[in-house]
Interface confidence: low
């Protein structure tokens, strides 16, 4: 709490300008009118205030707006936004996309902070839905935001927004989310040629069905093992040895190191040992020669 002290004679601020950087903290508190600050917030970012001085300016705004800042002030907070706590932000009602963009710009290049997460949450809830413009804005600043959404929320994501997604932004997505995102990515990238298409779709393949993996195996894509290990087990199981070899290309070598892990382990159990032997990797655990393979799921469906 800054002590209340009278403003020295001749120091009363007539406007927010460079001269204020020479004010001590107590002088800022005493000599800057909060209403003046609120109307001239757009000037604050052009002035190299210290963090301590910004603390004083925030305190003045908090006193003026104890129930939360109006959007006209929020939009021009600039670097002062970094001083806000999630509790401060929960009091706001942000409805303008321009306001959201302005504040995300301040945090650009940094990880999503609790403040930004709270801001986004307030904004989306205020809008009532995750519309295309909002999502385009959010994925432009935080493509990883997609993985924080539920599969239900993701279903409203337009395919055009998928273009903003980088591979690393899907690292935290679980299979249920990829199940929703993959068809959108497939649609978004459908007009690209083979190799370019694979580069773009690769990160989303954790949601791909068997038939799409079979199609990819015919295109010399050379999928790396890290991608293969993230594929849906149920999508991998029906692939033949020949299809997996074509899908992985030179990376088929890596199956040996992963033979005890899913989905490789489960896939091996479904293959004939004879077929596995043709890979020359020493993979063990396939169906011995002469054994009949019964598809029990088909049998159950018939009974």
């Amino acid at each position: 709490e800054v002590e209340k002290t009278a403003c020295p004679s001749g120091k009363k601020a007539r406007e927010i300008d460079e001269s204020l950087i020479f004010y001590k903290k107590w002088e800022l508190e005493a000599c800057v009118d909060a209403a003046l600050l609120a109307t001239q917030m757009d000037r604050v970012n052009a002035i190299p205030f210290t963090y301590e001085q910004l603390d004083v300016l925030k305190h003045k705004l908090d006193e003026l707006y104890p129930q939360g800042y109006p959007e006209s002030v929020i939009q021009h907070l600039g670097y002062l936004f970094l001083k806000m706590s999630p509790e401060d932000i929960r009091k706001w009602n942000v409805t303008s996309l321009e306001t959201l963009k302005a504040l995300l710009e301040v945090n650009k290049g940094h990880e999503m902070s609790p403040q930004v997460a709270t801001l986004i949450d307030r904004f989306v809830k205020g809008r009532g839905q995750l519309d295309k413009d909002t999502l385009d804005t959010l994925t432009a600043f935080y493509p990883g935001y997609l993985c924080s959404l539920s599969p239900e929320e993701l279903s409203s994501v337009p395919p055009s927004s998928i273009w903003a997604v980088r591979p690393q932004d899907l690292d935290t997505c679980d299979p249920r989310q990829l199940d929703v995102l993959y068809p959108k990515a497939r649609l978004a990238f459908q007009n690209m040629n083979g190799s370019e298409y694979f580069v773009k779709i690769q990160s989303f393949l954790g949601g791909a069905p068997t038939e799409d993996l079979k199609a990819l195996s015919q295109q010399n894509v050379s999928m790396d093992l890290a991608t293969f290990m993230k594929l849906r087990t149920d999508a991998v199981l029906p692939l033949t040895v020949a299809e997996v070899q074509k899908l992985l290309g030179p990376h088929v070598e890596g199956l040996k190191a992963e033979e005890r892990h899913r989905p490789v382990r489960d896939w091996i159990l479904r293959q004939r040992q004879d077929d596995l032997d043709t890979l020359g990797l020493g993979l063990q655990g396939g169906i011995p020669n002469g054994y009949l393979v019964l598809d029990l799921s088909m049998q159950e469906a018939l009974s």
Epitope: G249, P250, E253, D277, T278, L279, G280
Partner: nanobody, 115 residues
């Protein structure tokens, strides 16, 4: 049909080095991956190292940092440089490749590490 012939094995003291070669009867340029395996008496054949046509290498944990696989496409030859050899490296070393879904093996070369 690919024929593989290994050479370079022999008796070596612990800590010593050997370089194995595997000569292929056909151009290995078009062959995807070439590998080295070994089999010690009474044990299963063990995968040691592999090298893809684009130069990516793979090693079993037991030899990582000690063995180096390489290939010379112009000589149609695969190599295995083995350093810091231990008694447990004693085995018959085999060269392997797969072409057109056929598995090809050499006849093997004996490596004995003993003092």
């Amino acid at each position: 049909q690919v024929q593989l012939v290994e050479s370079g094995g022999g008796l070596v003291q612990p800590g010593g080095s050997l370089r194995l070669s595997c000569a292929a009867s056909t151009s290995i340029f078009s062959i995807g991956t070439m590998r080295w395996y070994r089999q010690a008496p009474g044990k299963q054949r063990e995968y040691i190292a592999g090298m893809t046509s684009d130069g990516t290498t793979y090693y079993a944990d037991s030899v990582k940092g000690r063995f180096t696989i390489s290939r010379d496409n112009s000589k149609n030859t695969l190599y295995l440089q083995m350093n810091s050899l231990r008694a447990e490296d004693t085995a018959v070393y085999y060269c392997n490749t797969v072409a057109h879904f056929q598995n090809y093996w050499g006849q093997g070369t004996q490596v004995t590490v003993s003092s």
